[in-house]
């Protein structure tokens, strides 16, 4: 946004933020036995020109950033999204009240980038 | 921006938008011989609850959406980002004025999703 370019306040660049998710907070405590929660993390921050190496930007994101500079009303900046995700193992009750241990993919953000 | 969150109007869901990028518009016409431009496309739109199947959401995005509903000031919605990218071949001059044909990865958005 114009304020991103002009503002004296620096917007933080795209990065990983820590976030602990409690399954009780999500209302899942009745079917998830363990863990009680997990470090999910999340991605947030600006993908502004110039995109540096820390931002793990794709070629498309670099092109989109340049187009956005010229046409901000029409084309958004690339967004800050996970680039590496990890699985977690969850012990839970299935619909028949059986206890199941299952690995859920793409649950934990390990790294973020501009996409 | 705040208007994205506060608005009562319905925002369009995360999807692929068409975008043709001219290399002349980017100021790259002096080193890129061909093509003159390409259909880069981009991703834009809301990743709002509930995330349906079309949104190619990861497990983490589903969790983040629920956390956002409870804590919108602290945790953003997942963002709409490319899930499938294609390469394009580019004919260009290198620093020594040699003509090079090179395949550039991740240049074209083929599909978008909530991440």
């Amino acid at each position: 946004s114009a304020s991103d370019y002009n503002s004296s306040e620096l917007k933080t660049a795209c990065r990983k933020h820590e976030l602990y998710v409690s399954f009780q907070d999500l209302g899942w405590q009745d079917w998830i036995i363990a863990p009680k929660g997990y470090a999910a993390n999340y991605c947030d921050g600006e993908c502004s020109f110039p995109l540096n190496a820390h931002m793990n930007a794709t070629n498309h994101a670099i092109v989109q950033t340049l187009v956005h500079l010229m046409n901000p009303e029409y084309v958004p900046k690339p967004c800050c999204a996970p680039t590496k995700l990890n699985a977690i193992s969850v012990l839970y009750f299935d619909d028949n009240s059986n206890v199941i241990l299952k690995k859920y993919r793409n649950m934990v953000v390990r790294a973020c980038g501009c996409h | 921006s705040a208007s994205d969150y506060n608005s009562s109007e319905l925002k369009t869901a995360c999807r692929k938008h068409e975008l043709y990028v001219s290399f002349q518009d980017l100021g790259w016409q002096d080193w890129i011989i061909a093509p003159k431009g390409y259909a880069a496309n981009y991703c834009d739109g809301e990743c709002s609850f509930p995330l349906n199947a079309h949104m190619n959401a990861t497990n983490h995005a589903i969790v983040q959406t629920l956390v956002h509903l409870m804590n919108p000031e602290y945790v953003p919605k997942p963002c709409c980002a490319p899930t499938k990218l294609n390469a394009i071949s580019v004919l260009y001059f290198d620093d020594n004025s040699n003509v090079i044909l090179k395949k550039y990865r991740n240049m074209v958005v083929r599909a978008c999703g909530c991440h």
Epitope: L69, M70, E73, Y74 | S1, S3, D4, S7, G27
Partner: antibody
Framework: QVQFVQSGAEVKKPGASVKVSCKAS????????MHWVRQAPGQRLEWMGW????????DYSQNFQGRVTITRDTYANTVYMELSSLRSEDTAVYYC???????????WGQGTLVTVSS | DIQMTQSPSTLSASVGDRVTITCRAS??????LAWYQQKPGKAPKLLIY???SLESGVPSRFSGSGSGTEFTLTISSLQPDDFATYYC?????????FGQGTKVEIK
């Protein structure tokens, strides 16, 4: 033909707000972004902000951040610019202008004079 | 922000004169420059875009040139209708910025 008709002149007291409208006709309203530009007496043109008429996204010049709000009504093909906490320096002619993708401002409204005076 | 500086601020000329107005950008804007004409009490009117492309319906006596940081607007033979203020504007890098204007008045 493409045309923009703006609301009439306004006189406001310092600290008040003003809302100027700009009705578009002659093209598909949601296909272009609309901008607001102002011109104080004897001054250069000053860009204020834009709205994407299709999705309602907005952005504003840092000079007006927190004081300006741009909205649109797609049913009425109208864009609005509201400026709050008015001061005497906001006395100016306010223009709406269309900007096509990759281009400059190709069509302008006739302008709305806003006078801020106690 | 990119600063746009026009010269001269005022220009006195006669009908039939060749008139040149200069616009400088504080950094390179490639060819992303527009020229507008504004008459008192009226909205600006687009004359030139992409530094040298003539807007539809604009007389051919108007021409633009330049790229990078230096641009010129030329009126080959000044007509009575051309006495006005002219503004340059860059649209290469957001936010868009205008020059301070050049007033072309009758000598």
């Amino acid at each position: 033909q493409v045309q923009f008709v703006q609301s009439g002149a306004e006189v406001k007291k310092p600290g008040a707000s003003v809302k100027v409208s700009c009705k578009a006709s002659g093209y598909t309203f949601t296909s272009h972004a609309m901008h607001w530009v102002r011109q104080a007496p004897g001054q250069r043109l000053e860009w204020m902000g834009w709205i994407n008429a299709a999705n309602g996204k907005t952005d504003y010049s840092q000079n007006f951040q927190g004081r300006v709000t741009i909205t649109r009504d797609t049913y009425a093909n109208t864009v609005y610019m509201e400026l709050s906490s008015l001061r005497s320096e906001d006395t100016a002619v306010y223009y709406c202008a269309r900007r096509p993708y990759g281009g400059p401002f190709d069509y302008w409204g006739q302008g709305t004079l806003v006078t801020v005076s106690s | 922000d990119i600063q746009m500086t026009q010269s001269p601020s005022t220009l006195s000329a006669s009908v039939g004169d060749r008139v040149t107005i200069t616009c400088r950008a504080s950094q390179s804007i490639s060819i992303w420059l527009a020229w507008y004409q504004q008459k008192p009490g009226k909205a600006p009117k687009l004359l030139i875009y992409k530094a040298s492309s003539l807007e539809s319906g604009v007389p051919s006596r108007f021409s633009g040139s330049g790229s990078g940081t230096e641009f010129t607007l030329t009126i080959s033979s000044l007509q009575p209708d051309d006495f006005a203020t002219y503004y340059c504007q860059q649209y290469n890098l957001y936010p868009w910025t205008f020059g301070q204007g050049t007033k072309v008045e009758i000598k």
